[in-house]
Amino acid sequence: EPTMYGEILSPNYPQAYPSEVEKSWDIEVPEGYGIHLYFTHLDIELSENCAYDSVQIISGDTEEGRLCGQRSSNNPHSPIVEEFQVPYNKLQVIFKSDFSNEERFTGFAAYYVATDINECTDFVDVPCSHFCNNFIGGYFCSCPPEYFLHDDMKNCGVNCSGDVFTALIGEIASPNYPKPYPENSRCEYQIRLEKGFQVVVTLRREDFDVEAADSAGNCLDSLVFVAGDRQFGPYCGHGFPGPLNIETKSNALDIIFQTDLTGQKKGWKLRYHGDPMPCPKEDTPNSVWEPAKAKYVFRDVVKITCLDGFEVVEGRVGATSFYSTCQSNGKWSNSKLKCQPVDCGIPESIENGKVEDPESTLFGSVIRYTCEEPYYYMENGGGGEYHCAGNGSWVNEVLGPELPKCVPVCGVPREPFEEKQRIIGGSDADIKNFPWQVFFDNPWAGGALINEYWVLTAAHVVEGNREPTMYVGSTSVQTSRLAKSKMLTPEHVFIHPGWKLLEVPEGRTNFDNDIALVRLKDPVKMGPTVSPICLPGTSSDYNLMDGDLGLISGWGRTEKRDRAVRLKAARLPVAPLRKCKEVKVEKPTADAEAYVFTPNMICAGGEKGMDSCKGDSGGAFAVQDPNDKTKFYAAGLVSWGPQCGTYGLYTRVKNYVDWIMKTMQENSTPRED
C-alpha cells in the first residue's frame, strides 16, 4: 500500500552489514505525489564506481544514483548527508555487498517522504494545452472563454463540430474567421444534400491561410474533404493549394479541420452548392441520343433510338428505341440496353426452290434463292437475292419482302422429238419429247399439263366423267408401267360454258368450245418426264397460218391397233378449214351438212396420212413459240375429225386464253397466290 513516509535501514544497522547480501526496498507514495529520499548516515565500503558494495536508487528504468563510502552533512542544522527528489510516486532502493570487507562498515540510514509535485512546472511536457492548475497531490487543466475541455481532461478546443448543412447553397468558415483559428481543435462539418445532387466546393486562394507543412511536407494544421471513399487534401499553407472548384461526385461531404497547439493563422472560408449529379455522355454504339447535349445531369431523360438495322431485344420481342434517365447516383438507367443488329432469322423455304444456308442472319446479310432448274424458274423476278433489312425482314430490291415464286418452265421438252421410222402415219415418241402429255384412262384420251395444278383437255373427254383418273410421266400406258408413273387426282372439272351438253353425246355434230380444265388436288412435281406446255400469247404473233407445223402426241388409235400402248407422235401442218369440211365423214351419225365448223377450230393434217385419231382427244397440238424457239405452246387441242388419217380439227386455244386465266385465277388456292 502506498505510504506518505518511511524509513530504510541497511541490514543489521547500526551494526556492520554482512557480506554477500542483496536487499531491495520498493517505495510507493500515493498518486500525484513525488518522493523525497534522504540519507542521514552513509558508511559503505568505497570502491571505484561503487563496484564492491553499494546502495542504488532506481526510478523506473533510470538510475537516480549509486552510493558508497562515508558521507557527512555539510549543513550543521541538517543531518542529511545525501538526498534525492523524484517527481514520480515509485522508487526502488537496492543494497548490495560483496564477499569481503576490509573494515567494519555500518551501512546506511535513509528516510522518504511524499512531497507534492507541481505537474504544471516540473515536467518538460506541459500536461495542459492551455491553463494548468496545481494542487497538493494533483493538478487540473482549464480553458479560456469559448473553449471547452476535451474528454482527456487535458486539451482544450473550440466547439466547432456537429453542424449539418442541407441547403443547396451555403458558406462555411473556420472558427473566428478571419481572426486566428483556435489551436488544438478538430472541427467537423457535414454537408448532406438530396440524392441526385453533388456537392461542389469553391474556394479563393486568398481566403485560405493555415499553418504551413513541416520540413517533411506534413501539414501541422490541415483541412480535409471526404466524400464517400474519395478524399481531397489534406491542405495547408498560405493560399489554397488545391483546385479552386472541387466536384465531389457525392451528395454527402465531410469537412475536417484539424489544428495543433501552435500557430496563429486566419484560417479559411469556402462556399458550396449542390449541382445536379452529372451522368457521363456515353458512347452507345449504333444509336442516336435525343436531345443531344454537351452535358447531362440528374433527372435528364434521353430517348435512345437504334440506327436502322439495329434493335433492343428482350426475349422474343424487340424495340427500336428506349428511354434512359440520369439517376441520382450519376449513372444512366437502362444502361444495359444495347442496340444490336436486327436478326432476320432463318429465311423461309420456298416450293420448288432452295435458299443457301446463310453465313449470318443479321442486318445487312445477303441470301440467294434459286429455283430447281431447268424445270422451274423465278416467276416474279428480282433475281432471288435478298438482304436482311432494318425491319427484320429479308427484302428483295424488286419484290420487297415477298418471297420468290418458282414456277414450272413451260414448253421445253427434255429431249426434242425426232421422227424416226415411219409407223403408219406417225412415229414412236418418248414422254421426254412431250412431258406435258397427260393420259386419261376413262375415256381413253389425252390432255396437256399447263401448270402444277391444271390440266387442259377437250370438253368431250370429261363431260361423261367428272372425276377422271390421269397419269403423267410415262411413255407406256401398260398397267404395270402406269403403276410406276404419277397418278393425278382431280379436284374439280371446269367445262367451257359454251360447250353444249347433250343427252346422247354420241350423236354430236357441234364440237364448238371443246375445251375443259381439270383442277388437281395436289401440285405436280416437275422433272424430265413431267413439265407443262405453254399457253399461246394473245398477240397476233400467235395467229396460225396455213402450213405452220405442229406436233401431236397420244396413245390413240393407229392403223394397226385400236389403242397404242407406247406414245406416238406426228408433225403436221395447219390447213385451211375448208380442207376439213371437204373430207367425207367416215361413220356419219347425221347429215354431213349438220357438222359445225367455227373460227374456234383449227384444221391440220392431210400430209402423208398423219393425223390424230380416237383416243388422242384432248392432247395438245404443240407449235413452236414464235417469240422463243426453244419453247412449244398449245395452239390446239385434239377435238374431232371427219376421218382418221386425213384432216383433224383442233380447238383453237388462243381464243380461250382469257377464260383459262380467269378460271384458274378464280379457283386458285392460297398456296398458289
Epitope: 433527372r299 431523360v301 430517348k303 433492343v312 428482350e314 426475349g315 420481342v317 424495340a319 428505341s321 428506349f322 428511354y323 434517365t325 439517376q327 447516383n329 449513372k331 438507367s333 437502362n334 444502361s335 444495359k336 440496353l337
Partner: antibody, heavy 116, light 107 residues
Framework: QVQLVQSGAEVKKPGASVKVSCKAS????????MHWVRQAPEQGLEWMGW????????IYAQKFQGRVTITADTSTNTAYMELSSLRSEDTAVYYC?????????WGQGTLVTVSS | DIQMTQSPKSLSASVGDRVTITCRAS??????LDWYQQKPGQSPKLLIY???YRYSGVPSRFSGSGSGTDFTLTISSLQPEDFATYYC?????????FGQGTKLEIK
C-alpha cells in the same frame, strides 16, 4: 426456361427486418435489372427499387430510402431484398421481376406479415 | 415522382364487349408505358409494352395506344379469361410508378 423462384412467407414483429430471396434460372441475372415490387392486401403495385447485378448499382424509391437494401449474388444467380424497421403497413406480397425493356418475368411473390 | 392515374377504378362488362381503360401520367412519359394484367393470387403478366406493342403470346384482342400523358388499353371482345385487374406503369424515369389499377368484373 426463365423462372424466378422466391423464398417462403415470413411473419415478423414491428421493428424487425426481413430478407427475401429471388433465385433466377434460365438466364444470367448479370444481363438484366432485377426489380422489387410490393403489393399490400387489396392494393395496387408499388415499385421499390432495382439492382444491376453486374456492378451492384442500385436505385431505390424515395419512400423506401434508408430502409431497403437490394443486393445480388451473381455466383448463385440470386437477388435479395431486405427491408428494415418493419411496421404493420409493410404487410404485403413482395415480388421480384426481371427487366431490360419491361417487366417480362415475375417471381411468384412472398407474403411478409408484420404483426406484434 | 410521376403519378399515374387510371380510370375507371372498376368496370363491369359482359363477354364479347369492347372495353377501354385509360391511364394518365402527371407529366410527359413519351411512349414509355406498359400494361399488365393481374388475376387474384397470381403475379402480374405483361400485355403491352412501349404503349402499343403487344407482348409475344398476348391475344390480338388486346391493343394499346397513346403517347405523352394519355394512354388507353382496349380489349376488342372480352373473353371469360380477361376478367382481372389491369395496371399501367411508366418506365420513362425512376421511380417507375404504377397506376392504382382497374378491376374488370363480369356484369
Amino acid at each position: 426456361q426463365v423462372q424466378l423462384v422466391q423464398s417462403g412467407a415470413e411473419v415478423k414483429k414491428p421493428g424487425a427486418s426481413v430478407k427475401v430471396s429471388c433465385k433466377a434460372s434460365g438466364f444470367n441475372i448479370k444481363e438484366y435489372y432485377m426489380h422489387w415490387v410490393r403489393q399490400a392486401p387489396e392494393q395496387g403495385l408499388e415499385w421499390m427499387g432495382w439492382i444491376d447485378p453486374e456492378n451492384a448499382d442500385t436505385i431505390y424509391a424515395q419512400k423506401f430510402q434508408g430502409r431497403v437494401t437490394i443486393t445480388a449474388d451473381t455466383s448463385t444467380n440470386t437477388a435479395y431484398m431486405e427491408l428494415s424497421s418493419l411496421r404493420s403497413e409493410d404487410t404485403a406480397v413482395y415480388y421480384c421481376a426481371r427487366s431490360r425493356l419491361f417487366f417480362a418475368y415475375w417471381g411468384q411473390g412472398t407474403l411478409v406479415t408484420v404483426s406484434s | 415522382d410521376i403519378q399515374m392515374t387510371q380510370s375507371p377504378k372498376s368496370l363491369s362488362a359482359s363477354v364479347g364487349d369492347r372495353v377501354t381503360i385509360t391511364c394518365r401520367a402527371s407529366q410527359d412519359v413519351r411512349t414509355a408505358l406498359d400494361w399488365y394484367q393481374q388475376k387474384p393470387g397470381q403475379s402480374p403478366k405483361l400485355l403491352i409494352y412501349s404503349a402499343s406493342y403487344r407482348y409475344s403470346g398476348v391475344p390480338s384482342r388486346f391493343s394499346g395506344s397513346g403517347s405523352g400523358t394519355d394512354f388507353t388499353l382496349t380489349i376488342s371482345s372480352l373473353q371469360p379469361e380477361d376478367f382481372a385487374t389491369y395496371y399501367c406503369q411508366q418506365q420513362y424515369t425512376t421511380p417507375y410508378t404504377f397506376g392504382q389499377g382497374t378491376k374488370l368484373e363480369i356484369k
